[in-house]
């Protein structure tokens, strides 16, 4: 009596069970009664990552250039390219089909946490005592310079953008 | 298309050198670069690759003394500094068979630039 | 570290012979492996390509294989022109070690 169910590793066909191609391989023809399941290599720049009965390899992904993207991690016969982004840029998604820019922290703002390839940089507005003057993606909130320190008075107050200004104390004839 | 290298001479130990590959009928916007050495009677070694983005990567080896970087769109320099005896070698530039990854086969070399350190 | 050992170092044939130069590789790489000839003087020319696959303008003569993490590069009806050294190169990760093998000298009697 033909079967109705295969074994694991195995698929029904014409009332047989028939070996599935190892990954890396796709489906030539199958099994007979006569004959084991032929599979043959995936090529170059294909893979299968399955116990499969495919008759054509997938193609490995593309990791483009022009989007940012660059290889991480090589496909091979049995498993598909990682892509990642290009320094300076990070993955819109999580699959990292494209790359965007690290956002830059605007004056008054410093870097909380700075970017990686999955994630944007995380600012923060800059506490009292704290500033910060440039745009950047690295740069965080930088204290106040501490006029007492070198016996100079403030001058000016500084903000979240600007630094304090230090001078001379005034000095009492 | 062809590829040719200068900038080799004689250097002293602890000098600087900057090696020029100039490329003809090449794409620097689409085609991927590389820099490999040889040293006198020894075998071919990889130094670094630099995409179409401009990214680079290096052998463990050559990270922080060598810089690759593209000058124009015909031109890209092999920067390397703190040179030593062991530098002394062959150097050549050739066109990698991918733009978007570090590790590549080289499918067009130049002739190569010696580079001599010695006091 | 990853190592690429290529073997023998240097081997001798005949003209119209073959001979057979191993690659193997510390590691998987799965089918990213390259092989170059190059003489004396010159820079080195890529022969084959992901283990087997032929560069263009490069006899059939030669021909490229891989079982696992060892690769093979046969050299048949050898000519006096094959005379070079040839050399193997991963390109899968460079992973701390240089992606070319030592080199192997072909020198046809």
């Known amino acids: 009596e033909p079967p109705t169910a295969c074994r694991e590793k195995q698929y029904l066909i014409n009332s047989q069970c028939c070996s599935l191609c190892q990954p890396g391989q796709k489906l030539v023809s199958d099994c007979t009664e006569f004959t084991e399941t032929e599979c043959l290599p995936c090529g170059e720049s294909e893979f299968l990552d399955t116990w499969n009965r495919e008759t054509h390899c997938h193609q490995h992904k593309y990791c483009d250039p022009n989007l940012g993207l660059r290889v991480q991690q090589k496909g091979t016969s049995e498993t598909d390219t990682i892509c990642t982004c290009e320094e300076g840029w990070h993955c819109t998604s999580e699959a990292c089909e494209s790359c965007v820019l690290h956002r830059s922290c605007s004056p008054g703002f410093g870097v909380k946490q700075i970017a990686t390839g999955v994630s944007d940089t995380i600012c923060e507005p800059c506490p009292v005592g704290f500033f910060s003057n440039v745009s950047s993606a690295f740069e965080k909130c930088h204290p106040w310079t501490s006029c007492e320190t070198k016996d100079l008075v403030v001058q000016q107050a500084g903000t979240n953008k600007t630094d304090v200004v230090c001078g001379p104390q005034d000095r009492l004839r | 298309q062809s590829l040719a290298e200068s900038g080799g001479r004689l250097v002293t130990p602890g000098g600087s050198l900057t090696l020029t590959c100039t490329v003809s009928?090449?794409?620097?916007?689409?085609?991927?670069m590389g820099w490999v050495r040889q040293g006198p009677g020894k075998g071919l070694e990889w130094i670094g690759t630099i995409r179409v983005t401009g990214g680079t990567d290096f052998a463990t080896w050559a990270k922080g003394r060598f810089t690759i970087a593209k000058t124009s769109s015909t031109t890209v320099d092999l920067k390397m500094t703190s040179l030593t005896t062991e530098d002394t070698a062959t150097y050549f530039c050739a066109r990698g068979h991918a733009n978007n990854d570090a590790y590549v086969y080289f499918n067009l070399w130049g002739q190569g630039t010696l580079v001599t350190v010695s006091s | 570290a990853f190592e690429l050992t290529q073997t023998p170092a240097s081997v001798e044939a005949g003209v119209g012979g073959t001979v057979t130069i191993k690659c193997q590789a510390s590691?998987?790489?799965?089918?990213?492996l390259a092989w170059y000839q190059q003489k004396p003087g010159q820079p080195p020319k890529l022969l084959m390509a992901a283990a087997a696959n032929l560069a263009s303008g490069v006899p059939s003569r030669f021909k490229g294989s891989r079982s696992g993490t060892e690769f093979t590069l046969t050299i048949s009806d050898l000519e006096c022109a094959d005379g070079a050294t040839y050399y193997c190169?991963?390109?899968?990760?460079?992973?701390?070690?240089?992606?070319f093998g030592g080199g192997t000298e072909v020198v046809v009697k």
């Open positions: 590691q998987s790489i799965d089918r990213y």
């Open positions: 190169q991963s390109y899968f990760t460079s992973d701390d070690g240089n992606t």
């Open positions: 009928g090449i794409d620097l916007s689409t085609d991927g």
